[in-house]
């Protein structure tokens, strides 16, 4: 048999070998596709199937607009002028080229030695699904699960049957000061079909530096709260990726899960003390915030205590 590849929505003509070019013709077309459950023999007189597969006067079969459901096998059996039976057999596959792939949510820069999301490559409207590949400086990037990580997702449109592919690239650059170029390409995997490429993105890789600052914000401002009130301490760090944050009270670590927010509900005198947060970043050591003092007292009977953060409500470590 012969393999035929047809573009979705385009017409396709399959010739019936051996069939006389004009009637009278002795021929039979049958098909087994997504529109049938077994072999369907087409009536030479035409009928309701003509909208999807029609026998032409010369004996060829016309598919006016091929669809996904037209994938399958088409066979013609004809008797030629000399009375010999001639068979034609076609295996039809369909395809649809998607729109140009795009890198969405691209990173603005990368940090060496830590995982960075480069961006997400998206291709919409392909059939069959095809594949997305990432390239670094023009060379194919092979995911290793460590320095190069690719997360893929394939979705099929419920009505059109066409595919949307998404590929998210995460890398750990080894050193700063470089300017790698990333691109993504879509391939249908069909012969004679060139891949579709995204516009490349060039990113700067910077060395991981210490976080620019660590701030401890306290609510209510001044750290003075009435008994039964609530205190919220927030550790604000500008580092990427966000570090783990632990809490210290009066010099001792608090046995709590790491969190950038510490909530003290229904405070009592036992909650009084000096609090600070410690941020632990993978690329450099722990960093501690300036302390804040929490006082539990009836409102208005005292001013800010010594060592509190005063009116501003925050302490900053340069």
């Amino acid at each position: 048999g012969q393999n035929i590849t047809a573009r979705i929505g385009e017409p396709l003509v399959l010739s019936c070998k051996g069939a006389p070019k004009k009637p009278p013709q002795q021929l039979e077309w049958k098909l087994n596709t997504g529109r049938t459950e077994a072999w369907k023999v087409l009536s030479p007189q035409g009928g309701p199937w003509d909208s999807v597969a029609r026998i032409l006067p010369n004996g060829s079969l016309l598919l006016p607009a091929t669809g996904i459901v037209d994938e399958g096998t088409f066979r013609c059996r004809a008797t030629n002028r000399r009375g010999k039976e001639v068979k034609s057999n076609y295996r039809v596959r369909v395809y649809q080229i998607p729109g140009k792939p795009e890198i969405v949510d691209p990173a603005s820069e990368l940090t060496a030695s830590v995982p960075n999301k480069v961006g997400t490559c998206v291709s919409e409207g392909s059939y069959p699904a095809g594949t997305l590949s990432w390239h670094l400086d023009g060379k194919l990037l092979i995911p290793d699960g460590k320095e190069t990580l690719v997360k893929e997702e394939t979705r099929r449109h419920p009505e059109t049957g066409l595919f949307t592919l998404r590929s998210e690239l995460t890398v750990i650059p080894t050193q700063g000061g470089t300017h790698p170029t990333f691109s993504c390409s879509f391939s249908l995997g069909l012969p004679r079909r060139r891949p579709l490429n995204t516009a490349p993105i060039q990113l700067r890789v910077r060395e991981p530096g210490p976080p620019e600052g660590i701030q401890l914000l306290v609510e209510p401002e001044g750290g003075i709260v009435a008994p039964g009130g609530t205190v919220t301490l927030t550790c604000a760090i500008s580092a990427q990726p966000p570090p783990q944050v632990h809490w210290i009270k009066d010099g001792a670590p608090l046995p709590l899960a790491p969190s950038p927010v510490l909530l003290l509900p229904e405070v009592g005198h036992e909650d009084e003390g000096t609090y600070s947060c410690v941020a632990t970043h993978p690329s450099h050591g722990p960093q501690e915030s300036p302390p804040v003092s929490i006082r539990v007292t009836e409102t208005g009977d005292e001013g800010p205590a010594e060592g509190s953060v005063g009116e501003s409500g925050l302490g900053t470590l340069a």
Partner: antibody, heavy 119, light 107 residues
């Protein structure tokens, strides 16, 4: 909203002719096959004719072949049925319906127009 | 030509009853069968397309099923507005063929 409105029915003598029309709206007319179906008084439904979306191919049952002609004007969103050599047994309500191929079957129908063949 | 043998030709039922109407095709017609409802003096209304699919705006008490060349329309709980005549149609081959109809009457 898909709408099909038939007209042109009436009383005609045996051997006479009549032309039915169907005005279509609410959909892209030239994307669909169109079909005429009839129903004799107190009887079931009977297929009369179908035409493909371009108007190039027409289909009839033996009972009306060579007497009836289905046609369409895609520019006017209109379907027609020319009925010649009418017989008493052609008396029926004639419905215009969208479809007639395997993609649609028959989905939307007009309200029908009555054709009476009697002397 | 394909014959569509519809049964029963009529039935009496009460509101709330489960009603089943069958069409048998004389040869394989695949999934290419529609079901219609027709009320006196009105045009047919499509209920089911391609044997099993519920048409837009049709209540979910209507369903279609297929076993080989046997096609079934089921009304799970008959409502007062369902008393009408029902037809099947095969559209796999010409001539397009309708079943003879089933008149559903109030018991």
């Amino acid at each position: 909203e898909v709408q099909l409105v038939e007209s042109g029915g009436g009383l005609v003598q045996p051997g006479g002719s009549l032309r039915l029309s169907c005005a279509a709206s609410g959909f892209t007319f030239n994307n669909y096959w169109m079909t005429w179906v009839r129903q004799a008084p107190g009887k079931g439904l009977e297929w009369v004719a179908s035409i493909d979306n371009s108007g190039d191919n027409t289909y009839y049952p033996d009972s009306v072949k060579d007497r009836f002609t289905i046609s369409r004007d895609n520019a006017k969103n209109s379907l027609y049925l020319q009925m010649n050599s009418l017989r008493a047994e052609d008396t029926a309500v004639y419905y215009c319906a969208r479809g007639g191929d395997i993609l649609v079957g028959l989905d939307y129908w007009g309200q029908g127009t009555l054709v009476t063949v009697s002397s | 030509d394909i014959q569509m043998t519809q049964s029963p030709s009529s039935l009496s039922a009460s509101v709330g009853d489960r009603v089943t109407i069958t069409c048998r095709a004389s040869q394989d017609v695949g999934i290419y069968v529609n079901w219609f409802q027709q009320k006196p003096g009105k045009a047919p209304r499509r209920l089911i397309y391609r044997a099993t699919n519920l048409a837009d705006g049709v209540p979910s008490r209507f369903s279609g099923s297929r076993s080989g060349t046997d096609f079934t329309l089921t009304i799970s709980s008959l409502q007062p507005e369902d008393f009408a005549t029902y037809y099947c149609l095969e559209f796999d081959e010409h001539p397009l063929t309708f079943g003879g109809g089933t008149k559903v009457e109030i018991k």
